[in-house]
Interface confidence: low
């Protein structure tokens, strides 16, 4: 329910779509600022979202989920959701150029109660409200739906994004910030504000920047899990959802001793769970099962109902079929519907892209490309044909370059190349760094099983994707003499990286000896590490031009950004260069219905997946 404290803040114009704010103070707030929504570049862009006769206005819904994993289409917006106010009324002017459309005022705010997860998925929907004389109220229709997965530390600067959905383009900024007294990149540490901006006293931690100065940090019970526990009072240890025990170190699912059902185990003294009514989850369509004294009960996701969530409450009027699917069903609010999906899509709402590459149609290590309308195989050197089934290689009478050895197998001849070389004759350098996978100016180093990034000062992570500024204070050690902090021209090669490169070189040398000894009986794993696969890995062009830049942490989204600057790495691109057949597939980012409450009377949510180009390894 909306607390009395908040009710005075809610203006009449703000959407009150039955928002119920949690009674507990949120740990922080995710903020989304929509900059523009309009026709994207290129041919076929729509002139207007409104029909020629009726004026309309826009509003937005956002849904947040934790983690980077691909989630079920029906899973809830576990981090929260928000619905915007409606924008100004827009009427199409005949003959006028297509504009950026008038937007609602203000931020969309999604409060979160627990720790900010650091990685999250978002869905942003753009809805159109047609203003007419409909007796049942205004007509709503979904114009565009974009989705993505991002890493974001709480307290960091605004991040900017462009997403395309069909012919529409959405530009927006977002950030996560902690609500006092919570601080930290996950908003899990609690701090009491210092009473005076003086130097910290004896025994207190060094002062952070002024806006985040704290007294001695709150000390939880000794041993309290830093990942799964937190405290609001000194000496206590309260567990995040899914964890239990005095120190929050026991996952809830493993606490079988607390189960009232089943026989006792002789070894543990715990009750061994017997078969229960929820075993195997009888709830369909992503419903969650809970046991009742007599049987079970399904909590159905938005859009489904019935004893086992088997009945869909969505109708064709709601536009439930995506990716060009044809909806068949009655207009009656209670009638069901069926989506007839176009080629390349499946699922009850045509929301899942058929991963035809998973059938491995490309032979001989070819790269599989699912173009939607067709499959393409990009063959490795020496192979040809629609499925790379024809072996063209014949290196008889021709030496393999760069220390490669000629190996006969399967009636054909092949070059087994030395480390770092590929191609038919081992004349091409196989460079895993060609795709520039290291973000924020990191240096890329190839080694025997892939690549390693040496990050510029101030960044960390496997691909240098994380800024190092917990609580606003740099966690980097002082730069050694002659190296200025933040100097993009100079790089520290971490000792671990040095060891890794050294180990890689030594390992490769041993491996080459091993391969050459084995001669004809060389196996696939040896061929891989000896450099046979030739691919210089490049990111495939992404269906969405997802550009993102980090900005300085001003008070709000700033506009001083080059939107067209390509990034080194698509934030949704995954580069893996450590196995023989590297293939690309397009994965539809799934949909996420139900939402949870927003703040200051804002909220939102529904369905429309967009493919993310992913390079991964088979």
């Amino acid at each position: 329910m909306v607390s009395p404290r908040m009710s005075g803040l809610l203006s009449q114009t703000v959407i009150l779509a039955l928002i119920f704010l949690p009674q507990t103070r949120p740990a922080g707030v995710f903020e989304l600022q929509i900059h523009s929504f309009g026709p994207g570049p290129g041919p076929g862009a729509p002139r207007s979202p409104c029909s020629a006769r009726l004026p309309c206005r826009l509003f937005f819904r956002v849904c947040l989920k934790p983690g980077l994993s691909e989630e079920a289409a029906e899973s809830p917006c576990a981090l929260g959701a928000a619905l915007s106010a409606r924008g100004p009324v827009y009427t199409e002017q005949p003959g006028a150029p297509a504009p950026d459309l008038p937007l609602p005022d203000g931020l969309l705010q999604v409060p979160f109660r627990d720790a900010w997860p650091g990685t999250f998925s978002f869905i942003i929907e753009t809805w159109r409200e047609e203003l007419g004389d409909q007796i049942g109220g205004p007509a709503w229709s979904l114009l565009a739906r974009v989705a993505g997965r991002r890493r974001l530390a709480a307290g960091g600067p605004w991040a900017r994004d462009i997403q395309r959905a069909g012919a529409w383009e959405l530009r927006f900024s977002y950030r996560a910030r902690c609500e006092p007294p919570a601080v930290g990149t996950a908003c899990t540490r609690l701090c009491r504000p210092r009473s005076a901006p003086s130097r910290c006293g004896p025994g207190l931690r060094p002062c952070a920047p002024l806006e985040d100065e704290c007294e001695a940090p709150l000390v939880c019970r000794a041993g309290c899990s830093p990942e799964h526990g937190f405290c609001e009072q000194p000496g206590e240890c309260r567990c995040l959802e899914g964890w239990t025990g005095p120190l929050c170190t026991v996952p809830v699912s493993t606490s079988s001793c607390l189960s009232p059902r089943g026989p006792s185990s002789a070894t543990t003294g715990c009750l061994v769970p017997g078969p229960g009514p929820c075993d195997g989850n009888p709830c369909a369509n992503g419903g969650s099962c809970s046991e009742t004294p007599r049987s079970f009960e399904c909590t159905c996701p938005r859009g489904f109902y019935g004893l086992r969530c088997e009945v869909s409450g969505v109708t064709c009027a709601d536009g439930p079929c995506f990716n060009g699917g044809l909806c068949v069903g009655g207009a009656d609010p209670d009638s069901a519907y069926i989506c007839h999906c176009p080629p390349g899509f499946q699922g009850s709402n045509c929301e899942k892209r058929v991963d035809r590459c998973s059938l491995q149609p490309c032979r001989n290590g070819g790269l599989c490309l699912d173009l939607g309308h067709a499959l393409r195989c990009r063959c490795r050197a020496g192979f040809a044909g629609p499925r790379c089934e024809h072996d063209l290689d014949d290196c008889a009478g021709r030496a393999c370059a760069n220390g490669g050895t000629c190996v006969e197998g399967g009636g054909a001849h092949r070059c087994s190349c030395a480390l770092g070389f590929g191609g038919r004759d081992c004349r091409e350098r196989a460079d895993p760094c060609a795709a520039r996978p290291c973000a924020h100016g990191g240096r890329c180093y190839a080694h025997f099983s892939g690549l390693v990034c040496a990050c510029a000062p101030g960044y960390m992570g496997a691909r240098c994707e994380f800024p190092v500024h917990p609580d606003g204070a740099s966690a980097l050690p002082a730069a050694p003499p002659g190296l200025r902090p933040g100097d993009p021209q100079r790089y520290l090669l971490p000792p671990a990286l040095g060891l890794l490169v050294a180990a890689g070189v030594a390992g490769a040398a041993l491996l080459l000896v091993h391969v050459r000894r084995r001669g004809h009986s060389q196996d696939a794993g040896s061929r891989l590490l000896a450099g046979t696969p030739e691919p210089s890995v490049h990111a495939l062009p992404d269906a969405l031009n997802n550009l993102r830049t980090q900005e300085g942490s001003g008070d709000g989204p700033s506009s001083s950004v080059d939107w067209n600057r390509p990034e080194d790495v698509d934030p949704q691109g995954i580069y893996v260069i450590s196995a023989p057949s590297i293939y690309a597939r397009e994965v539809a980012t799934p949909l996420f219905p139900p939402l949870h409450t927003g703040r200051a009377g804002q909220r939102q949510h529904l369905l429309f997946p967009y493919p993310s180009s992913i390079l991964s390894v088979k």
């Epitope: 009150l16 409606r86 809805w127 409200e129 109220g137 938005r302 859009g303 139900p594 939402l595 369905l607």
Partner: nanobody, 115 residues
Framework: EVQLVESGGGLVQPGGSLTLSCAAS????????MGWYRQAPGKQRELVAV???????NYADSVKGRFTISRDNAKNSVYLQMNSLRAEDTAVYYC?????????WGQGTLVTVSS
């Protein structure tokens, strides 16, 4: 799933008044509009009044000026104040919650206008 529970129906004389209430329980974030429909014996279900999440209202012509729909977000409820009731208003009144992507119905409450 959201449960909708109607109350307030009953027998009333022509010209009298009644207030119907509909309480929603469960996860109701996505409710786009809540409204009242009615179904008289042998007739089709028809819309009486609706109030959207943006607080705009619409009424059937036959009830304009006599019925008023309102909602109380703090109580998750929607109300229908019915004045100057007529015999032709006799029907089972259903609460309706329309989401952006689905519709839920209550069980209905009977309103009988008779002298």
């Amino acid at each position: 799933e959201v449960q909708l529970v109607e109350s307030g129906g009953g027998l009333v004389q022509p010209g009298g008044s009644l207030t119907l209430s509909c309480a929603a329980s469960g996860s109701i974030f996505s409710i786009a509009s809540m409204g009242w429909y009615r179904q008289a014996p042998g007739k089709q279900r028809e819309l009486v009044a609706v109030i959207t999440s943006f607080s705009s209202t619409n009424y059937a012509d036959s009830v304009k000026g006599r019925f008023t729909i309102s909602r109380d977000n703090a109580k998750n409820s929607v109300y229908l104040q019915m004045n100057s009731l007529r015999a032709e208003d006799t029907a089972v009144y259903y609460c309706n919650a329309r989401y952006f992507e689905r519709t839920d119905w209550g069980q209905g409450t009977l309103v009988t206008v008779s002298s």
